[in-house]
């Protein structure tokens, strides 16, 4: 990464260094240390203070974005004296060259697309590269298949999400022969970016007085159980006047997903379709194929 690290320190320096790959801030251990503390301050003056590592000469920042530029700071007291050192971590490169409008979505339970746009001041020869790191194993995933626009990478397709965890760090680096390109980084929750498939195996069975709709929960990337789903059923009478309201029914997920409703014979032609969402987020899937029941002469 082409980011300058500038140190602001008194004469006897702690030699503070930051590894953006591991998000680890470290410094030279001092003899007879009685107190040590590390933190960062971002451009909005928010302070993040992680736990110190056991050796007390390093700390790891778990969930931070760096593209707006941050300042790291280390305070160490020994039995003899106190040390303080700042480390500026700017996003070097020309302003406006970083990838922008970055977004990702998971679909079909095991595929992910990420897209971005080239920075407005990026030169013609700019090339972007996406790296993803999960929160648990700190494993780095490099984009396996880039989506291109006139030779420039403007997206990424992943068909193997096994390296992801519930929260992941996305980094888009840029290169150019002409000028330095700024980076863009983002933290994304898989549960917030997943688009569910509609429910499957939708069936309707009717007797003389009622109709029973059954369906199966969609397969998802996230590990969800049946109570984690919310469903909406659209029961629609065919050949009604335009502007007639559809009946939208909310149904909580259950071990056996079913909805029983009164509908007596003779029964006009109806259609039913279903969509699904995570009960906590209500990011609705597309509708399932409409299933028809009843008859035209009902």
């Amino acid at each position: 990464e082409k980011s300058d690290l500038r140190t602001v320190a008194p004469a006897s320096s702690l030699n503070v260094r930051f590894d953006s790959r591991t998000m680890n801030l470290s410094w030279d251990c001092q003899e007879n240390t009685t107190f040590s503390k590390c933190f960062l301050t971002d451009k909005k003056n928010r302070v993040v203070e992680p736990r110190l590592s056991n050796n007390e000469c390093s700390c790891t920042f778990r969930e931070i974005c760096l593209h707006e530029g941050v300042t790291f700071e280390v305070h160490v007291n020994t039995s003899q004296r106190g040390f303080q050192q700042k480390l500026l971590y700017p996003n070097s490169g020309r302003e406006g060259t970083a990838a922008q409008n970055f977004s990702c979505f998971i679909y079909n339970a095991d595929l992910m697309n990420c897209t971005w746009a080239r920075g407005p001041t990026a030169p013609r020869d700019v090339q972007y590269f996406l790296y993803i790191r999960n929160s648990k194993r700190r494993r780095e995933i490099r984009c396996p298949y880039y989506i291109q626009d006139s030779g420039t990478h403007v997206g990424c397709h992943l068909d193997n999400l096994s390296g992801l965890t519930s929260r992941n760090y996305f980094l888009v680096n840029g290169t150019s022969r002409e000028i330095g390109i700024q980076f863009f980084d983002s933290l994304l929750d898989t549960k917030k970016i997943e688009r569910f498939n509609p429910p499957s195996n939708v069936t309707v069975r009717c007797n003389t007085t009622h109709c029973l709709v059954r369906w199966k929960q969609p397969r998802t990337y996230q590990k969800l159980s049946y109570l984690d789903f919310q469903y909406q059923l659209d029961v629609h009478r065919k050949n009604t006047q335009p502007g007639t309201e559809n009946l939208l029914i909310n149904v909580s997920g259950d071990l056996e997903n079913r909805y029983n409703f009164p509908s007596s014979e003779p029964r006009a032609k109806h259609s039913v379709k279903i969509r699904a969402a995570d009960v906590r987020i209500l990011n609705w899937s597309s509708w399932s194929e409409a299933i028809e029941f009843g008859s035209d002469d009902g």
Partner: antibody, heavy 120, light 111 residues
């Protein structure tokens, strides 16, 4: 309707092992996450372990590690709990349950419980 | 000692409203992990009353409601009935210990 039918009460001597079964009817065990929880008058409810889909394996509470084994026979839709090196404070009602939500882990269906008494 | 703290008992007259508190810490309820509530009638297995902090499974009457704020949660029973007399337990997940944790239980008595 889903039901969890547990094996009958057991009386065991300290140091022995006990195996409790939990038969699922009305649904396929392979599609479910089964967990085991025990209840004592003194300690209340204690979670022992169960299938974690995130790890894709059965995980155990640290305090039972090494003494507890949870297995599943999906061909007969039955889950098993084996607890070894029994002590008197293992006297409890042991429940199997189905996880209805993985967000915070909510146990939706429960077996009726199996009373295990450890006494010399 | 239960990880989540509940009052040992609460009581109310029929028709009244009672609330049960459940206090945790920053590694469970405040982490934030979802809270579930269970009702246990004497001699029976627990029954899920609330999941996802405030959602009721089908079949649970809307007299039961719950909420969560910070490191604590609460369950409210309105229009108290004789058959609400039972033990009530809260439950969540604790990231520090990596285990599912329960409250010590609250006995609800209908006067």
């Amino acid at each position: 309707q889903v039901q969890l039918v547990q094996s009958g009460a057991e009386v065991k001597k300290p140091g022995a092992s006990v195996k409790v079964s939990c038969k699922i009817s009305g649904h396929s065990l392979s599609e479910l996450s089964i967990h085991w929880v025990r209840q004592t008058p003194t300690k209340g409810f204690e979670w022992m372990g169960g299938f974690d889909p995130e790890e894709n394996e059965i995980v155990y509470a640290q305090r039972f590690q090494g003494r507890v084994t949870m297995t599943e026979d999906t061909s007969i839709d039955t889950a098993y709990l084996t607890l070894s090196s029994l002590r008197s404070d293992d006297t409890a009602v042991y429940y199997c349950s189905i996880v209805g939500s993985f967000s915070g882990w909510a146990f939706d269906y429960w077996g009726k419980g199996t009373m295990v008494t450890v006494s010399s | 000692q239960a990880v989540l703290t509940q009052p040992s008992s609460v009581s109310g007259a029929p028709g009244q409203r009672v609330t049960i508190s459940c206090t945790g810490s920053g590694s469970n309820i405040g982490a934030p992990y979802d809270v579930s509530w269970y009702q246990q009638l004497p001699g029976t297995a627990p029954k899920l009353l609330i999941y996802h902090n405030n959602k009721r499974p089908s079949g649970v009457p809307d007299r039961f409601s719950a909420s969560k704020s910070g490191t604590s949660a609460s369950l409210a029973i309105t229009g108290l009935q004789a058959d609400d007399e039972a033990d009530y337990y809260c439950q969540s997940y604790d990231s520090r210990t990596g285990i599912i944790v329960f409250g010590g239980g609250t006995k609800v008595t209908v006067l």
